[in-house]
Amino acid sequence: IWELKKDVYVVELDWYPDAPGEMVVLTCDTPEEDGITWTLDQSSEVLGSGKTLTIQVKEFGDAGQYTCHKGGEVLSHSLLLLHKKEDGIWSTDILKDQKEPKNKTFLRCEAKNYSGRFTCWWLTTISTDLTFSVKSSRGSSDPQGVTCGAATLSAERVRGDNKEYEYSVECQEDSACPAAEESLPIEVMVDAVHKLKYENYTSSFFIRDIIKPDPPKNLQLKPLKNSRQVEVSWEYPDTWSTPHSYFSLTFCVQVQGKSKREKKDRVFTDKTSATVICRKNASISVRAQDRYYSSSWSEWASVPCS
Amino acid sequence: RNLPVATPDPGMFPCLHHSQNLLRAVSNMLQKARQTLEFYPCTSEEIDHEDITKDKTSTVEACLPLELTKNESCLNSRETSFITNGSCLASRKTSFMMALCLSSIYEDLKMYQVEFKTMNAKLLMDPKRQIFLDQNMLAVIDELMQALNFNSETVPQKSSLEEPDFYKTKIKLCILLHAFRIRAVTIDRVMSYLNAS
């Protein structure tokens, strides 16, 4: 058993049929010695008496808020949560496996630049009695500070018969140098509590590996005289690290017909303009990627040819 | 501690081309190592990230763009002084800091070159003959060093009398390639910045 936060405790349980329960001794936080009784949750029934209560925790029915009282007055609370371990593996019932980039990916994180700011998100089908708490650091043995905000519900989607909820959190490394070469990964730890079930999820990454620039901005077409060609121009996204001559991007320009089956013409360039042939009803899209370190491409910025 | 925004004459910055070749070569070599050594811990998640130049050179700090010198987190106290007479420099217009930056890059390349050559000698003794260093990568390191053209003491190639542990050598190769790729990215960024300045 360990303390998650004040008056909230996590009991770690081996979850197999013939596992014995965990013996837990609850102590009432009071100088009083006599006349102390214990109750659980909303029930007023006395579960035991005395300054300590010894219980066997084996099921979710044994978890909950234990309260000690004296003469109708509440003295203290202890909320017990369960953390299940099945076949040596901690349960992952609360969050959905996103399976990207690999199986057992519950947390996904992205950064728009090298400033040390990043966003992580996760999915669940649970809609109520759900809380998240996020902590992060650079490295684990001698951790350096990363500050995370509160996790918020960022999207709701309908997937077949189920509703899916996306939560996200923003974190910022306390003293980040955009030009630094990372040798210690960022660690992100999410505590998830659903009713009386506790689970924790972790992700470890280098900012350089989760970079995904915003799409190029101010995408414009300039027709060239007496030609089907157009000059496409764009700018670095505002959120990208500066100076741009140091944090350079490379771009992919794509001409896509109305039909998805039509052949796509693609051009790669380090410049912020390109000359392409604009077909009728086609659209021109441009996306960006770090020029020197191949992390993710940005989403496409698009304009119609017409 | 930073790179001033100087304006070298056109064509006076041949190092950019060499640094691009370097990044391409080390990236290809790392990809080859990851594929060939697929049953070894050779991915970014699996390896320990070691920097053989740590406390010996200060490339990131010495080559910091002017715009980032206002960022306190980028100003590290490590100082290293180097001999400064490189041919990538735009002669009279080059500041001391720019020379310090480029000589720091040169020292990095020299250190990695020695490590890679020593390692290759060991890998050539492996009866499995599983992996060797790409000669192109070693050549590209050499070309960039020549372009930087700093006079520096030659570091003797390390020789080892004991029987090499090939498993450990291959893991060390992965560690070295990952670190060198990260440094090659920094070098490329620096050269791009200097070229645009």
């Epitope: 949750d41 066997q56 084996k58 979710f60 029915g61 | -």
Partner: antibody, heavy 119, light 107 residues
Framework: EVQLVQSGAEVKKPGESLKISCQSS????????IGWVRQMPGQGLEWIGI????????RYNPMFRGQVTMSVDKSSSTAYLQWSSLKASDTAMYYC????????????WGQGTMVTVSS | EIVLTQSPATLSASPGERATISCRAS??????LAWYQQKPGQAPRSLIY???NRQSGIPARFSGSGSGTDFTLTISSLEPEDFAVYYC?????????FGQGTRLEIK
């Protein structure tokens, strides 16, 4: 006052289905799991299983798994035990009981439902 | 599963006497053992839990002791209403199991 009131005695033929009930009152129904115990004529007590009234989480005794089904209706604070195809060997007294949280034993018991299966 | 063996199967005693019933487990159940009393035509009633804790409303003449594999239920001075069948039950490991019962009869 804590009370578990069970449905009346049943006489059935082999192969028939049956569902007996246990209605709880006098306490917070969702705080306490409900269990079932069998007592064959002139025999001792046998633990069938327990069930959470919150989310219908169930722990069956392997000996009874597939033979009986436990269920619960939170809205009426009622637990059920059912058979899809009775056998003569199912003849017994069935007790529902309330599981004490933080312990696991049964602190309050229903009066029992006698089930007789005979052709 | 854990087998609980009660002894004796039948105990004959007189009112006012001390009665002791033993329950032995085939493997340790820590202190997670309960005792029940059942009278003819009635449902069992909880007497003792966690080996030695008396259920609320149970007279002080009933006491329990033991831990691990050996447990004892003691009735210090028998009253006429105490003649019944007594069962021990372990609730440490699933499936929870009961002893075969001890019949306490009037001598």
């Amino acid at each position: 006052e804590v009370q578990l009131v069970q449905s009346g005695a049943e006489v059935k033929k082999p192969g028939e289905s049956l569902k007996i009930s246990c209605q709880s009152s006098g306490y917070s129904f969702t705080t306490y799991w409900i269990g079932w115990v069998r007592q064959m004529p002139g025999q001792g007590l046998e633990w069938i299983g327990i069930m959470s009234p919150v989310d219908s989480d169930i722990r069956y005794n392997p000996m009874f798994r597939g033979q009986v089904t436990m269920s619960v209706d939170k809205s009426s604070s009622t637990a059920y035990l059912q058979w899809s195809s009775l056998k003569a060997s199912d003849t017994a007294m069935y007790y529902c009981a309330r599981r004490r949280p933080g312990q696991g034993y049964f602190d309050f018991w229903g009066q029992g439902t006698m089930v007789t299966v005979s052709s | 599963e854990i087998v609980l063996t009660q002894s004796p199967a039948t105990l004959s005693a007189s009112p006012g006497e001390r009665a002791t019933i033993s329950c032995r487990a085939s493997q340790s159940v820590s202190s997670w053992l309960a005792w029940y009393q059942q009278k003819p035509g009635q449902a069992p009633r909880s007497l003792i839990y966690a080996a030695s804790n008396r259920q609320s409303g149970i007279p002080a003449r009933f006491s329990g002791s033991g831990s691990g594999t050996d447990f004892t239920l003691t009735i210090s001075s028998l009253e006429p209403e105490d003649f019944a069948v007594y069962y021990c039950q372990q609730y440490n490991i699933y499936p929870y199991t009961f002893g075969q019962g001890t019949r306490l009869e009037i001598k």
